[in-house]
Interface confidence: low
């Protein structure tokens, strides 16, 4: 009677172990008299010849599929060979692909590090991860690795990185996309510029001056505060750009330094001061505004 190769489990999943046992026929004496060797497709496995009738393959992969058998050699050099057993390693298709971000929430400060983490809930073997930007799908990076997650890193986030992203994972059963993730790049406000707009070249008491404050860079919404010296005159919000304005009816007391502040929750910036001077009225002459 020949040897018997016992494979456990007989239909392994990728990444899992397989135990091979070379079973002696019942008529043979103690296993201790034999040396054993396991083969796959004519290639010896593990340690080669050994006194152990068992061999564990810690991680089976798709490419380990093949024809396996074992041999036993007696002290007298007689070689016994088992029948060949076909082992087909089952690959688990990727499923449940998700794209997550660090920092979480998809909001990153300009200049900070952004990581797009593509994960699959299951899947074995070499998984190819692909990252795409925008609905049209500009391919950013491709990585192939034996892990359930992979990272795409943007070391320094810029305004142009604000987009929708998705990733795709596949391991031979067709691509599986994640959902779209929107990235917002949050930009601190730049130093605002304060402009004074008068209805005429030389404004007089009673005219309405428009103080206009605008930060040219910064994530919206931006809240603007208007100051006379260090006293807050009022505030105005700009939900979507263009700056904000504050109307001021001129009186002689309005002489002094004016400034504005922009704040979008990522930091505040104060403008340079603008000085407005009024002359004390005499006779019929007008009070003129000089800046």
């Amino acid at each position: 009677a020949g040897l018997l190769l016992i494979v456990s489990p007989s239909h392994p999943t990728e990444g899992s172990p397989v135990n091979l046992t070379c079973k002696m026929p019942s008529l043979q004496s103690s296993d201790a008299q034999f040396q054993f060797c396991f083969f796959r497709d004519d290639q010896a496995l593990g340690p080669g010849w050994s006194s152990s009738p068992k061999l564990q393959i810690a991680n089976m992969w798709k490419e380990d599929s093949g024809s396996y058998w074992c041999e036993a050699q007696t002290m007298a050099s007689k070689v016994l060979r088992s029948w060949r057993s076909q082992i087909n390693v089952h690959r688990v298709p990727v499923a449940d692909v998700s794209l997550e971000t660090q920092p979480p929430g998809g909001q990153v400060m300009e200049g900070d590090r952004l990581v797009l983490i593509c994960s699959v809930a299951m899947g074995t073997g070499d998984i190819t991860f692909l990252w795409y930007k925008g609905a049209i799908g500009l391919n950013l990076q491709t990585k192939t690795q034996r892990s359930l997650t992979a990272e795409y890193e943007i070391p320094t986030a810029r305004e142009s990185d604000a987009e929708q992203y998705y990733c795709v994972a596949e391991n031979g059963y067709g691509p599986r996309p994640s959902g779209l993730v929107s990235i917002t790049v949050r930009i601190p406000v730049s130093r605002p510029i304060l402009m004074v707009r008068a209805p005429r070249a030389q404004a007089v008491v009673g005219d309405v001056l428009k103080l206009h404050c605008e930060a040219l860079r910064g994530s919206h919404p931006i809240l603007y505060w208007f100051y006379h010296e260090d006293v807050i005159l009022g505030s105005s919000s700009a939900p979507s750009g263009g700056g904000a304005s504050f109307n001021l009816s001129l009186t002689a007391e309005h002489s002094g330094n004016y400034s504005c502040e922009a704040n979008n929750g990522l930091g505040a910036q104060r403008s340079e001061e603008v000085t407005l001077n009024f002359t004390v009225p005499t006779g019929a002459r007008s009070n003129h505004l000089t800046s």
């Epitope: 920092p103 034996r146 892990s147 993730v181």
Partner: antibody
């Protein structure tokens, strides 16, 4: 079952280096990031860094960038952390820990490092 | 870095009592895309390595008794032990993993 095996203790002299090991078993080593955590006697937990066993890419806590170096050996399913220029401040228990979905789900028993002349 | 603050630093309770401990983060740990909070709770018994109890702020790790419950969202989180057992004597740490991991300083649970 998942196991992370670490040596119990290391006694080292100031100014020298030590390489701590962490042997993983019971799971596919390359699929999960390995993190290292420091705990000084009677103190809390402090993250040192992490390594992706698949690519070998590592990230460090800024505080430990010049102190620790993380490596892996895929063939032996082992992770290593080398600590250099040791001082008494480095005397602590060092844990390796596997990370799954962000949380540290399996921990080694820790290696106690004592820096003493 | 995200700073994690735990309170109280220690508490002593009798067996069978209910215990709550707090963990606050310096910024939100809630990820809007999946509505998950990137927060875990660990138990460290004397002379042992830490053990994962709760992840995603409220998901109990396999094998953890159901007397342990995690709750909270955003920046405020709570670990509750519904009926303390003598074996629960330990230090409990919260940890965020929305960025490079940081731990709270721990809450030491003592049994009266």
């Amino acid at each position: 079952q998942v196991q992370l095996q670490q040596p119990g203790a290391e006694l080292v002299k100031p100014g020298t280096s030590v390489k701590l090991s962490c042997k993983a078993s019971g799971y596919t080593f390359t699929r999960y990031w390995m993190h290292w955590v420091k705990q000084r006697p009677g103190q809390g937990l402090e993250w040192i860094g992490r390594i992706d066993p698949n690519s070998g890419g590592s990230k460090y806590n800024e505080k430990f960038k010049s102190k620790a170096t993380l490596t892996v050996d895929k063939t032996s399913s082992s992770a290593y952390m080398q600590l250099n220029s040791l001082t008494s401040e480095d005397s602590a228990v060092y844990y390796c820990t596997r990370v799954n979905s962000g949380a540290m789900d399996y921990w080694g028993q820790g290696t106690s490092v004592t820096v003493s002349s | 870095d995200i700073v994690m603050s735990q309170s109280p630093s220690s508490l002593a309770v009798s067996v069978g009592e209910k215990v709550t401990m707090s963990c606050k983060s310096s910024q939100s740990l809630l990820y809007s895309s999946n509505q998950k909070n990137y927060l875990a709770w660990y138990q460290q018994k004397p002379g042992q390595s830490p053990k994962l109890l709760i992840y995603w702020a409220s998901t109990r790790e396999s094998g953890v008794p159901d007397r342990f419950t995690g709750s909270g969202s955003g920046t405020d989180f709570t670990l509750t032990i519904s009926s303390v057992k003598a074996e629960d004597l330990a230090i409990y740490y919260c940890q965020q993993y929305s960025n490079y991991p940081t731990f709270g300083s721990g809450t030491k649970l003592e049994i009266k």
